[in-house]
């Protein structure tokens, strides 16, 4: 049995920040689980991890330098990514693993979410002041 995951097809990060919600066909509240967000078609970069155990507080961390936070719903985990760079525009995949009680469960690979990071549009200031009029 595999858990099904639903994600928005595309999100735009206007202020270099975005909320990505991973919706599961599974209630996580009475489980020990590891929810993670992966970057790239090959999911090579583990962006953020939310570790949950029904009797303890959520642990949220990134080992790859991303600024992230996570929130748990009974059938969802929302990742809040901040300080994203334009060059981090990519496809991001939600992954879920139920560690306990057994048996171990994980998800069918989702379609992913393209996160398009739009940099802040700041008015460019000239490097050199123009010639001053007499």
């Amino acid at each position: 049995n595999k858990i099904l995951v639903k994600q928005s097809p595309m999100l735009v990060a206007y202020d270099n920040a975005v909320n990505l919600s991973c919706k599961y066909s599974y209630n996580l509240f009475s489980r020990e689980f590891r929810a993670s967000l992966h970057k790239g078609l090959d999911s090579a970069v583990e962006v953020c991890v939310v570790y949950g155990n029904y009797s303890q507080q959520l642990q949220v961390y990134s080992k790859t330098g991303f600024n992230c936070d996570g929130k748990l719903g009974n059938e969802s985990v929302t990742f809040y990514l901040q300080n994203l760079y334009v060059n981090q525009t990519d496809i991001y995949f939600c992954k879920i693993e139920v560690m306990y009680p057994p048996p171990y469960l994980d998800n069918e690979k989702s379609n992913g979410t393209i996160i398009h990071v739009k940099g802040k549009h700041l008015c460019p200031s000239p490097l050199f002041p123009g010639p001053s009029k007499p």
């Epitope: 209630n27 009475s30 029904y54 057994p102 048996p103």
Partner: antibody, heavy 120, light 107 residues
Framework: VKLQQSGAELVKPGASVRLSCKAS????????IHWIKLRSGQGLEWIGW????????QYNAKFKGKATLTADKSSSTVYMELTGLTSEDSAVYFC??????????????WGQGTMVTVSS | DIQMTQSPASLSVSVGETVTITCRTN??????LAWYQQKQGKSPQLLIY???HLVEGVPSRFSGSGSGTQYSLKITSLQSEDFGNYYC?????????FGGGTKLEIK
């Protein structure tokens, strides 16, 4: 899915007994088996569970030292051994399969029960 | 450990009536609760899981409700085959305690 339990037992105080629960109709190593006690005139009491896939076990603290859960994968059987028997252990013991309903647990399949009578 | 308080302990009713059995817990179990029916000399039978979900094949006169720490099993238009013992059980960690049971008798 079928859980077939061993027959009734008449045992002396202080002795031990091993009850069996033979599973069929599903992949034995993929489901947790729970054990439950029912004493005459009283309610159901949860003893513990056993997961044959990894030999993971959880006991009710009340039954630690009283019940020991094991399994034999080759015969798809879970066992419960009860030691140091007293009249308090006279009861019907059920095994039941835990199913995971998308993250919510329940026991939809039960064995027929094994009656244990402790008497000298 | 989670404490399960089931009430009433016994109930004497007539065929056709409606009954409600309640189960209270000492902490939030987030709907991780099942209800069982057990008849004399038989194994328990699962009626409801996840507090509100009726098991396939169980008559629709049975229904479960509740959330947080308070849950109920309602049986409408009682039939003669509904008499017996009823138990709730939580699955919020271990031990997976049962309620004390409710004996439903014919008046």
């Amino acid at each position: 899915v079928k859980l077939q339990q061993s027959g009734a037992e008449l045992v002396k105080p202080g002795a031990s007994v091993r009850l069996s629960c033979k599973a069929s109709g599903y992949t034995f190593t993929e489901y947790i088996i729970h054990w439950i006690k029912l004493r005459s005139g009283q309610g159901l009491e949860w003893i513990g569970w056993f997961y044959p896939g990894s030999n993971d076990i959880q006991y009710n603290a009340k039954f630690k030292g009283k019940a020991t859960l094991t399994a034999d994968k080759s015969s798809s059987t879970v066992y419960m051994e009860l030691t140091g028997l007293t009249s308090e252990d006279s009861a019907v013991y059920f095994c039941a399969r835990r199913d995971d309903f998308s993250g919510y647990d329940a026991l939809p399949y039960w064995g027929q029960g094994t009656m244990v009578t402790v008497s000298s | 450990d989670i404490q399960m308080t089931q009430s009433p302990a016994s109930l004497s009713v007539s065929v056709g009536e409606t009954v409600t059995i309640t189960c209270r817990t000492n902490e939030n179990i987030y709907s991780n609760l099942a209800w069982y029916q057990q008849k004399q000399g038989k194994s328990p039978q699962l009626l409801i899981y996840a507090a509100t979900h009726l098991v396939e094949g169980v008559p629709s006169r049975f229904s479960g409700s509740g959330s947080g720490t308070q849950y109920s099993l309602k049986i409408t238009s009682l039939q003669s085959e509904d008499f017996g013992n009823y138990y709730c059980q939580h699955f919020w960690g271990t031990p997976c305690t049962f309620g004390g049971g409710t004996k439903l008798e014919i008046k």
